[in-house]
Protein backbone atom coordinates (compact mmCIF):
# COMPACT_ATOMS: atom_id res chain seq x y z
CA UNK A 1 0.00 0.00 0.00
CA UNK A 2 1.45 3.36 -1.03
CA UNK A 3 0.56 6.43 0.99
CA UNK A 4 -1.15 4.41 3.70
CA UNK A 5 -0.99 4.19 7.47
CA UNK A 6 -0.78 1.39 10.02
CA UNK A 7 -3.98 -0.50 10.72
CA UNK A 8 -5.23 -1.39 14.19
CA UNK A 9 -6.11 -4.78 15.64
CA UNK A 10 -9.52 -5.93 14.44
CA UNK A 11 -9.93 -3.04 12.01
CA UNK A 12 -9.97 -5.31 8.93
CA UNK A 13 -10.73 -8.74 10.41
CA UNK A 14 -11.40 -10.32 7.00
CA UNK A 15 -7.87 -9.61 5.70
CA UNK A 16 -5.67 -12.68 5.31
CA UNK A 17 -2.08 -13.21 4.19
CA UNK A 18 -1.45 -15.89 1.57
CA UNK A 19 2.06 -17.20 2.07
CA UNK A 20 4.17 -19.72 0.23
CA UNK A 21 6.48 -22.13 2.01
CA UNK A 22 9.20 -23.47 -0.24
CA UNK A 23 12.74 -23.38 1.18
CA UNK A 24 11.81 -20.13 2.91
CA UNK A 25 8.38 -18.72 3.62
CA UNK A 26 7.08 -15.46 2.23
CA UNK A 27 3.92 -13.40 1.84
CA UNK A 28 2.76 -13.46 -1.77
CA UNK A 29 -0.79 -12.09 -1.81
CA UNK A 30 -3.68 -10.91 0.30
CA UNK A 31 -7.18 -12.33 0.47
CA UNK A 32 -10.55 -11.79 2.13
CA UNK A 33 -12.36 -14.15 4.45
CA UNK A 34 -15.93 -14.46 3.15
CA UNK A 35 -17.12 -17.48 5.13
CA UNK A 36 -15.97 -19.94 7.79
CA UNK A 37 -14.17 -21.99 5.17
CA UNK A 38 -13.80 -19.59 2.24
CA UNK A 39 -11.28 -16.95 1.14
CA UNK A 40 -11.68 -14.79 -1.96
CA UNK A 41 -8.52 -13.68 -3.74
CA UNK A 42 -7.01 -13.01 -7.19
CA UNK A 43 -6.50 -15.80 -9.71
CA UNK A 44 -3.08 -14.49 -10.73
CA UNK A 45 -1.74 -15.23 -7.25
CA UNK A 46 -1.63 -18.88 -8.33
CA UNK A 47 0.15 -18.33 -11.66
CA UNK A 48 2.97 -20.85 -11.63
CA UNK A 49 2.08 -22.00 -8.11
CA UNK A 50 -1.13 -24.03 -8.26
CA UNK A 51 0.05 -26.62 -5.73
CA UNK A 52 -2.20 -26.48 -2.69
CA UNK A 53 0.29 -27.85 -0.18
CA UNK A 54 2.85 -25.02 -0.52
CA UNK A 55 0.36 -22.40 0.67
CA UNK A 56 -0.23 -21.20 4.22
CA UNK A 57 -3.08 -18.83 5.02
CA UNK A 58 -2.75 -16.58 8.05
CA UNK A 59 -5.87 -14.92 9.41
CA UNK A 60 -6.46 -12.73 12.44
CA UNK A 61 -3.02 -11.16 12.21
CA UNK A 62 -1.83 -7.57 12.02
CA UNK A 63 1.96 -7.83 11.99
CA UNK A 64 3.71 -10.30 9.68
CA UNK A 65 6.80 -10.19 11.88
CA UNK A 66 4.75 -11.77 14.68
CA UNK A 67 4.44 -14.97 12.66
CA UNK A 68 6.61 -17.79 14.03
CA UNK A 69 6.77 -21.50 13.35
CA UNK A 70 4.18 -21.90 16.09
CA UNK A 71 1.66 -19.44 14.61
CA UNK A 72 -1.46 -21.33 13.49
CA UNK A 73 -2.34 -21.19 9.82
CA UNK A 74 -4.96 -22.63 7.50
CA UNK A 75 -4.19 -25.00 4.68
CA UNK A 76 -5.96 -25.21 1.36
CA UNK A 77 -8.46 -27.91 0.58
CA UNK A 78 -9.32 -26.59 -2.87
CA UNK A 79 -8.31 -23.73 -5.18
CA UNK A 80 -11.12 -22.69 -7.53
CA UNK A 81 -9.83 -20.38 -10.26
CA UNK A 82 -12.45 -18.71 -12.45
CA UNK A 83 -12.96 -20.89 -15.50
CA UNK A 84 -12.50 -17.94 -17.87
CA UNK A 85 -9.27 -16.70 -16.30
CA UNK A 86 -6.35 -17.29 -18.61
CA UNK A 87 -2.77 -16.38 -17.81
CA UNK A 88 -2.59 -15.13 -21.40
CA UNK A 89 -5.45 -12.63 -21.07
CA UNK A 90 -5.77 -11.23 -17.57
CA UNK A 91 -9.56 -10.96 -17.30
CA UNK A 92 -11.67 -12.69 -14.62
CA UNK A 93 -8.91 -12.32 -12.05
CA UNK A 94 -10.75 -14.03 -9.23
CA UNK A 95 -10.30 -17.24 -7.26
CA UNK A 96 -11.88 -18.97 -4.29
CA UNK A 97 -9.94 -20.89 -1.68
CA UNK A 98 -11.68 -23.57 0.35
CA UNK A 99 -9.87 -24.08 3.63
CA UNK A 100 -9.20 -27.56 4.98
CA UNK A 101 -10.92 -26.69 8.26
CA UNK A 102 -13.50 -24.02 9.05
CA UNK A 103 -12.35 -20.99 11.02
CA UNK A 104 -14.05 -19.75 14.16
CA UNK A 105 -15.04 -16.09 14.03
CA UNK A 106 -13.47 -13.75 16.56
CA UNK A 107 -13.10 -10.01 16.94
CA UNK A 108 -9.94 -10.24 14.82
CA UNK A 109 -11.06 -12.88 12.34
CA UNK A 110 -14.44 -12.55 10.70
CA UNK A 111 -15.83 -12.24 7.19
CA UNK A 112 -16.55 -9.28 4.97
CA UNK A 113 -20.03 -8.86 3.52
CA UNK A 114 -20.38 -9.39 -0.19
CA UNK A 115 -22.23 -6.96 -2.46
CA UNK A 116 -25.52 -7.68 -4.13
CA UNK A 117 -25.37 -9.33 -7.53
CA UNK A 118 -24.67 -6.83 -10.32
CA UNK A 119 -24.58 -3.94 -7.86
CA UNK A 120 -24.26 -0.92 -10.16
CA UNK A 121 -26.57 1.60 -8.53
CA UNK A 122 -24.77 2.03 -5.20
CA UNK A 123 -22.51 5.06 -5.09
CA UNK A 124 -19.60 4.23 -2.82
CA UNK A 125 -17.82 7.24 -1.37
CA UNK A 126 -15.85 5.71 1.50
CA UNK A 127 -13.52 3.04 0.12
CA UNK A 128 -10.33 1.56 1.55
CA UNK A 129 -7.64 -0.78 0.29
CA UNK A 130 -5.55 -2.84 2.71
CA UNK A 131 -2.50 -5.06 2.51
CA UNK A 132 1.08 -5.80 3.47
CA UNK A 133 2.42 -4.88 0.02
CA UNK A 134 5.15 -2.45 -0.98
CA UNK A 135 4.93 1.14 0.26
CA UNK A 136 6.59 2.37 -2.95
CA UNK A 137 7.36 0.91 -6.36
CA UNK A 138 10.88 -0.08 -5.33
CA UNK A 139 9.80 -1.11 -1.87
CA UNK A 140 9.48 -4.15 0.34
CA UNK A 141 6.71 -6.11 2.04
CA UNK A 142 5.48 -4.23 5.12
CA UNK A 143 5.29 -5.82 8.54
CA UNK A 144 2.17 -4.00 9.76
CA UNK A 145 -1.05 -4.19 7.75
CA UNK A 146 -1.48 -0.91 5.88
CA UNK A 147 -4.70 0.90 4.96
CA UNK A 148 -5.43 3.70 2.54
CA UNK A 149 -8.59 5.61 1.63
CA UNK A 150 -8.98 5.76 -2.16
CA UNK A 151 -11.90 7.05 -4.26
CA UNK A 152 -13.44 4.95 -7.00
CA UNK A 153 -13.12 6.29 -10.53
CA UNK A 154 -15.48 5.57 -13.39
CA UNK A 155 -14.63 2.87 -15.89
CA UNK A 156 -14.73 5.50 -18.63
CA UNK A 157 -12.10 7.57 -16.84
CA UNK A 158 -10.06 4.45 -16.10
CA UNK A 159 -10.17 3.37 -19.75
CA UNK A 160 -8.76 6.77 -20.78
CA UNK A 161 -5.79 6.17 -18.48
CA UNK A 162 -5.19 2.65 -19.77
CA UNK A 163 -5.69 2.89 -23.49
CA UNK A 164 -3.68 -0.25 -24.20
CA UNK A 165 -5.89 -2.32 -21.92
CA UNK A 166 -9.55 -3.25 -22.02
CA UNK A 167 -11.22 -2.05 -18.82
CA UNK A 168 -14.32 -4.20 -18.67
CA UNK A 169 -17.53 -3.82 -16.67
CA UNK A 170 -16.24 -6.63 -14.50
CA UNK A 171 -13.45 -4.40 -13.24
CA UNK A 172 -13.52 -1.38 -10.93
CA UNK A 173 -10.82 1.26 -10.65
CA UNK A 174 -9.70 3.42 -7.75
CA UNK A 175 -7.15 6.16 -7.43
CA UNK A 176 -6.37 9.85 -7.17
CA UNK A 177 -5.67 11.89 -10.29
CA UNK A 178 -2.45 13.12 -8.71
CA UNK A 179 -1.45 9.61 -7.59
CA UNK A 180 0.28 9.09 -4.27
CA UNK A 181 -2.11 6.50 -2.81
CA UNK A 182 -2.60 3.04 -4.22
CA UNK A 183 -2.14 -0.69 -3.80
CA UNK A 184 1.23 -2.13 -4.85
CA UNK A 185 3.23 -5.37 -5.13
CA UNK A 186 2.12 -7.85 -2.49
CA UNK A 187 -1.39 -6.39 -2.14
CA UNK A 188 -2.88 -8.55 -4.91
CA UNK A 189 -5.92 -10.57 -3.96
CA UNK A 190 -6.63 -8.32 -0.99
CA UNK A 191 -9.76 -6.29 -0.43
CA UNK A 192 -11.08 -3.00 -1.73
CA UNK A 193 -13.87 -2.40 0.78
CA UNK A 194 -16.42 0.38 0.91
CA UNK A 195 -18.64 1.44 3.80
CA UNK A 196 -22.25 2.03 2.84
CA UNK A 197 -25.17 2.48 5.23
CA UNK A 198 -22.88 1.60 8.11
CA UNK A 199 -21.77 -1.71 6.60
CA UNK A 200 -18.48 -2.71 4.96
CA UNK A 201 -18.78 -4.51 1.65
CA UNK A 202 -16.17 -6.20 -0.53
CA UNK A 203 -16.32 -4.15 -3.72
CA UNK A 204 -13.05 -5.17 -5.36
CA UNK A 205 -10.12 -7.59 -5.36
CA UNK A 206 -6.71 -5.98 -5.87
CA UNK A 207 -5.52 -7.01 -9.33
CA UNK A 208 -3.20 -4.75 -11.33
CA UNK A 209 -1.96 -1.29 -12.24
CA UNK A 210 0.92 0.26 -14.12
CA UNK A 211 3.51 1.00 -11.49
CA UNK A 212 2.08 2.04 -8.13
CA UNK A 213 0.44 5.33 -7.13
CA UNK A 214 1.45 7.04 -10.36
CA UNK A 215 -0.33 10.17 -11.52
CA UNK A 216 -3.41 9.34 -13.62
CA UNK A 217 -2.79 5.58 -13.34
CA UNK A 218 -5.49 4.19 -11.04
CA UNK A 219 -5.41 0.75 -9.53
CA UNK A 220 -7.58 -1.87 -11.21
CA UNK A 221 -9.64 -4.31 -9.17
CA UNK A 222 -11.86 -7.27 -9.98
CA UNK A 223 -15.46 -6.14 -9.42
CA UNK A 224 -16.91 -8.61 -6.93
CA UNK A 225 -20.59 -7.78 -7.63
CA UNK A 226 -20.13 -9.06 -11.18
CA UNK A 227 -19.08 -12.47 -9.87
CA UNK A 228 -21.73 -13.10 -7.24
CA UNK A 229 -23.41 -15.85 -9.26
CA UNK A 230 -20.05 -17.56 -9.70
CA UNK A 231 -19.14 -17.20 -6.02
CA UNK A 232 -22.48 -18.57 -4.85
CA UNK A 233 -22.43 -21.41 -7.38
CA UNK A 234 -18.94 -22.54 -6.38
CA UNK A 235 -19.41 -22.22 -2.64
CA UNK A 236 -22.82 -23.89 -2.69
CA UNK A 237 -21.82 -26.77 -4.94
CA UNK A 238 -18.83 -27.44 -2.72
CA UNK A 239 -20.58 -26.88 0.62
CA UNK A 240 -24.10 -28.04 -0.06
CA UNK A 241 -25.17 -24.65 1.20
CA UNK A 242 -23.68 -21.20 1.09
CA UNK A 243 -22.07 -19.76 4.17
CA UNK A 244 -21.29 -16.38 2.71
CA UNK A 245 -21.72 -13.04 4.34
CA UNK A 246 -24.14 -11.41 1.93
CA UNK A 247 -25.87 -8.15 2.76
CA UNK A 248 -29.41 -8.49 4.03
Amino acid sequence: IVGGTNSSWGEWPWQVSLQVKLTAQRHLCGGSLIGHQWVLTAAHCFDGLPLQDVWRIYSGILNLSDITKDTPFSQIKEIIIHQNYKVSEGNHDIALIKLQAPLNYTEFQKPICLPSKGDTSTIYTNCWVTGWGFSKEKGEIQNILQKVNIPLVTNEECQKRYQDYKITQRMVCAGYKEGGKDACKGDSGGPLVCKHNGMWRLVGITSWGEGCARREQPGVYTKVAEYMDWILEKTQSSDGKAQMQSPA
Epitope: A24, D47, G90, E140, Y162, D164, E210
Partner: antibody
Protein backbone atom coordinates in the same frame (compact mmCIF):
# COMPACT_ATOMS: atom_id res chain seq x y z
CA UNK B 1 3.34 -22.62 -22.79
CA UNK B 2 5.02 -19.33 -21.87
CA UNK B 3 7.45 -18.48 -24.64
CA UNK B 4 9.54 -15.71 -26.20
CA UNK B 5 10.97 -16.05 -29.69
CA UNK B 6 13.44 -13.54 -31.12
CA UNK B 7 14.06 -12.97 -34.82
CA UNK B 8 15.67 -10.42 -37.12
CA UNK B 9 19.33 -10.95 -36.34
CA UNK B 10 22.00 -11.23 -38.98
CA UNK B 11 25.12 -9.70 -40.48
CA UNK B 12 25.14 -5.96 -40.99
CA UNK B 13 27.83 -3.42 -41.89
CA UNK B 14 28.98 -0.75 -39.43
CA UNK B 15 26.63 2.23 -39.63
CA UNK B 16 23.81 -0.01 -40.80
CA UNK B 17 20.42 -0.78 -39.25
CA UNK B 18 18.56 -3.85 -38.07
CA UNK B 19 15.18 -4.45 -36.47
CA UNK B 20 14.78 -7.26 -33.98
CA UNK B 21 11.40 -8.75 -33.07
CA UNK B 22 10.30 -10.85 -30.14
CA UNK B 23 7.04 -12.78 -30.34
CA UNK B 24 5.46 -13.56 -26.97
CA UNK B 25 2.93 -16.26 -26.20
CA UNK B 26 1.34 -17.97 -23.20
CA UNK B 27 1.01 -14.91 -20.94
CA UNK B 28 -0.67 -11.50 -20.75
CA UNK B 29 1.98 -9.67 -22.77
CA UNK B 30 0.39 -6.25 -22.20
CA UNK B 31 0.74 -6.67 -18.42
CA UNK B 32 4.53 -7.00 -18.38
CA UNK B 33 7.63 -4.83 -18.65
CA UNK B 34 9.79 -6.20 -21.44
CA UNK B 35 13.53 -5.99 -21.94
CA UNK B 36 16.37 -6.55 -24.35
CA UNK B 37 19.60 -8.00 -22.97
CA UNK B 38 22.71 -8.84 -24.97
CA UNK B 39 25.83 -10.92 -24.58
CA UNK B 40 28.90 -10.11 -26.65
CA UNK B 41 31.22 -13.04 -27.49
CA UNK B 42 33.23 -13.98 -24.40
CA UNK B 43 31.55 -11.30 -22.27
CA UNK B 44 28.85 -11.15 -19.59
CA UNK B 45 25.19 -10.17 -19.91
CA UNK B 46 24.43 -6.51 -20.60
CA UNK B 47 20.99 -4.94 -20.22
CA UNK B 48 20.15 -2.91 -23.33
CA UNK B 49 16.65 -1.47 -22.99
CA UNK B 50 13.28 -1.82 -21.25
CA UNK B 51 9.72 -0.77 -21.94
CA UNK B 52 6.71 -0.47 -19.63
CA UNK B 53 3.52 -2.52 -20.17
CA UNK B 54 1.71 0.22 -22.08
CA UNK B 55 4.84 1.35 -23.90
CA UNK B 56 4.71 4.81 -22.35
CA UNK B 57 8.01 4.49 -20.51
CA UNK B 58 11.30 3.41 -22.10
CA UNK B 59 14.84 3.18 -20.77
CA UNK B 60 18.19 2.55 -22.41
CA UNK B 61 21.74 1.67 -21.46
CA UNK B 62 24.14 4.56 -22.07
CA UNK B 63 25.97 2.47 -24.67
CA UNK B 64 22.93 2.42 -27.01
CA UNK B 65 21.12 5.65 -26.11
CA UNK B 66 20.22 7.67 -29.20
CA UNK B 67 20.89 4.75 -31.55
CA UNK B 68 18.44 2.06 -30.43
CA UNK B 69 14.66 2.34 -30.02
CA UNK B 70 12.52 -0.14 -28.12
CA UNK B 71 8.80 -0.43 -28.90
CA UNK B 72 5.96 -2.89 -28.56
CA UNK B 73 2.69 -3.78 -30.23
CA UNK B 74 0.43 -5.23 -27.58
CA UNK B 75 -2.20 -6.19 -30.14
CA UNK B 76 0.40 -8.45 -31.79
CA UNK B 77 2.12 -9.57 -28.58
CA UNK B 78 5.40 -8.42 -30.07
CA UNK B 79 8.42 -6.51 -28.78
CA UNK B 80 10.81 -4.68 -31.11
CA UNK B 81 14.32 -3.24 -31.05
CA UNK B 82 15.22 -0.85 -33.85
CA UNK B 83 19.02 -0.63 -34.02
CA UNK B 84 20.58 2.18 -36.02
CA UNK B 85 24.19 3.38 -36.48
CA UNK B 86 25.43 -0.07 -35.56
CA UNK B 87 29.02 -0.52 -34.39
CA UNK B 88 31.32 -3.51 -34.15
CA UNK B 89 30.89 -3.49 -30.36
CA UNK B 90 27.14 -4.13 -30.81
CA UNK B 91 27.98 -7.64 -32.02
CA UNK B 92 26.23 -9.98 -29.60
CA UNK B 93 23.45 -12.44 -29.00
CA UNK B 94 20.33 -10.37 -28.25
CA UNK B 95 17.81 -11.80 -25.81
CA UNK B 96 14.27 -10.72 -25.18
CA UNK B 97 13.28 -11.08 -21.51
CA UNK B 98 10.13 -10.58 -19.46
CA UNK B 99 10.42 -8.31 -16.43
CA UNK B 100 8.03 -7.44 -13.63
CA UNK B 101 4.34 -7.19 -14.40
CA UNK B 102 1.37 -4.96 -13.73
CA UNK B 103 -0.10 -7.63 -11.46
CA UNK B 104 0.32 -6.75 -7.81
CA UNK B 105 1.51 -10.03 -6.35
CA UNK B 106 4.84 -10.22 -4.53
CA UNK B 107 6.60 -11.91 -7.42
CA UNK B 108 8.80 -9.24 -8.86
CA UNK B 109 12.12 -7.93 -10.01
CA UNK B 110 13.72 -10.72 -11.99
CA UNK B 111 13.66 -11.41 -15.71
CA UNK B 112 11.83 -14.71 -15.39
CA UNK B 113 11.20 -15.65 -19.02
CA UNK B 114 13.88 -15.42 -21.73
CA UNK B 115 14.06 -16.24 -25.40
CA UNK B 116 16.90 -18.26 -26.89
CA UNK B 117 18.38 -15.15 -28.50
CA UNK B 118 19.20 -13.95 -31.99
CA UNK B 119 22.75 -13.25 -33.19
CA UNK B 120 23.68 -9.80 -34.49
CA UNK B 121 27.04 -9.45 -36.19
CA UNK B 122 28.32 -6.00 -37.15
CA UNK B 123 31.26 -6.33 -39.50
CA UNK B 124 32.53 -4.99 -42.79
CA UNK C 1 24.82 4.27 -12.54
CA UNK C 2 25.04 1.31 -10.17
CA UNK C 3 28.00 -1.00 -10.78
CA UNK C 4 27.92 -4.67 -9.84
CA UNK C 5 31.15 -6.48 -9.01
CA UNK C 6 31.03 -10.24 -8.98
CA UNK C 7 33.70 -12.55 -7.57
CA UNK C 8 35.36 -14.80 -8.33
CA UNK C 9 35.25 -14.51 -12.12
CA UNK C 10 35.75 -18.26 -12.32
CA UNK C 11 36.13 -21.22 -9.98
CA UNK C 12 36.78 -24.93 -10.21
CA UNK C 13 34.79 -27.28 -8.04
CA UNK C 14 33.77 -30.91 -7.74
CA UNK C 15 30.36 -32.52 -7.55
CA UNK C 16 29.14 -32.33 -3.96
CA UNK C 17 31.16 -29.20 -3.13
CA UNK C 18 29.63 -26.18 -1.45
CA UNK C 19 30.05 -23.18 -3.76
CA UNK C 20 29.75 -19.52 -2.81
CA UNK C 21 29.66 -16.59 -5.24
CA UNK C 22 29.55 -12.98 -4.10
CA UNK C 23 28.23 -9.82 -5.66
CA UNK C 24 28.83 -6.28 -4.47
CA UNK C 25 26.83 -3.20 -5.50
CA UNK C 26 28.43 0.26 -5.74
CA UNK C 27 25.56 1.64 -3.63
CA UNK C 28 22.73 0.23 -1.55
CA UNK C 29 20.15 -1.64 -3.58
CA UNK C 30 18.05 -2.95 -0.68
CA UNK C 31 17.01 -6.49 -1.75
CA UNK C 32 16.78 -5.73 -5.47
CA UNK C 33 19.30 -8.39 -6.45
CA UNK C 34 18.68 -11.39 -8.69
CA UNK C 35 20.82 -14.38 -9.65
CA UNK C 36 20.80 -16.18 -13.02
CA UNK C 37 22.31 -19.37 -14.35
CA UNK C 38 23.46 -19.35 -17.96
CA UNK C 39 24.63 -22.28 -20.06
CA UNK C 40 26.06 -21.96 -23.60
CA UNK C 41 23.38 -21.91 -26.28
CA UNK C 42 20.59 -21.75 -23.70
CA UNK C 43 18.43 -18.95 -22.33
CA UNK C 44 19.54 -17.54 -18.96
CA UNK C 45 17.50 -18.92 -16.07
CA UNK C 46 16.31 -16.92 -13.07
CA UNK C 47 17.35 -18.70 -9.85
CA UNK C 48 16.88 -16.19 -7.04
CA UNK C 49 15.00 -12.90 -6.95
CA UNK C 50 14.78 -10.27 -4.25
CA UNK C 51 18.17 -11.43 -2.86
CA UNK C 52 16.80 -14.55 -1.17
CA UNK C 53 13.59 -15.74 -2.84
CA UNK C 54 13.96 -19.02 -4.70
CA UNK C 55 12.31 -18.88 -8.11
CA UNK C 56 9.61 -21.50 -8.48
CA UNK C 57 10.97 -24.79 -9.78
CA UNK C 58 14.59 -24.09 -8.81
CA UNK C 59 16.21 -26.80 -6.61
CA UNK C 60 16.55 -25.96 -2.93
CA UNK C 61 20.34 -26.44 -3.01
CA UNK C 62 20.45 -22.88 -4.39
CA UNK C 63 20.08 -20.09 -1.87
CA UNK C 64 20.72 -16.37 -1.76
CA UNK C 65 21.39 -13.89 1.00
CA UNK C 66 22.40 -10.29 1.54
CA UNK C 67 21.02 -6.80 1.84
CA UNK C 68 22.21 -3.35 0.81
CA UNK C 69 25.51 -3.79 -1.01
CA UNK C 70 26.77 -7.32 -0.31
CA UNK C 71 25.09 -10.46 -1.63
CA UNK C 72 25.87 -14.16 -1.83
CA UNK C 73 24.69 -17.07 -3.96
CA UNK C 74 25.32 -20.47 -2.40
CA UNK C 75 25.03 -23.91 -3.98
CA UNK C 76 25.01 -26.27 -1.02
CA UNK C 77 26.01 -29.40 -2.91
CA UNK C 78 27.13 -28.91 -6.49
CA UNK C 79 25.47 -31.21 -9.03
CA UNK C 80 26.71 -32.08 -12.55
CA UNK C 81 24.02 -29.88 -14.12
CA UNK C 82 25.15 -26.85 -12.09
CA UNK C 83 28.34 -26.27 -14.10
CA UNK C 84 27.49 -22.99 -15.82
CA UNK C 85 28.05 -19.24 -15.61
CA UNK C 86 26.21 -17.34 -12.86
CA UNK C 87 25.28 -13.67 -13.09
CA UNK C 88 23.96 -11.27 -10.47
CA UNK C 89 21.70 -8.38 -11.50
CA UNK C 90 20.44 -5.30 -9.68
CA UNK C 91 16.96 -3.98 -10.46
CA UNK C 92 16.89 -1.10 -7.98
CA UNK C 93 17.81 1.58 -10.52
CA UNK C 94 17.33 0.38 -14.06
CA UNK C 95 19.28 -2.85 -14.53
CA UNK C 96 22.95 -3.84 -14.25
CA UNK C 97 24.50 -7.29 -14.43
CA UNK C 98 27.66 -8.43 -12.73
CA UNK C 99 30.52 -9.73 -14.87
CA UNK C 100 29.62 -13.37 -14.27
CA UNK C 101 31.21 -16.33 -12.48
CA UNK C 102 32.06 -19.42 -14.48
CA UNK C 103 31.78 -22.60 -12.40
CA UNK C 104 33.95 -25.29 -13.98
CA UNK C 105 34.65 -28.93 -13.21
CA UNK C 106 37.82 -29.45 -11.17
Amino acid sequence: EVQLLESGGGLVQPGGSLRLSCAASGFTFSFYNMNWVRQAPGKGLEWVSSISPSGGETNYADSVKGRFTISRDNSKNTLYLQMNSLRAEDTAVYYCARGGGAYRNNWWGGFDIWGLGTMVTVSS
Amino acid sequence: DIQMTQSPSSLSASVGDRVTITCRASQSISVYLNWYQHKPGKAPKLLIYGASNLQFGVPSRFSGSGYGTDFTLTISSLQPEDFATYHCQQTFSLFTFGGGTKVEIK
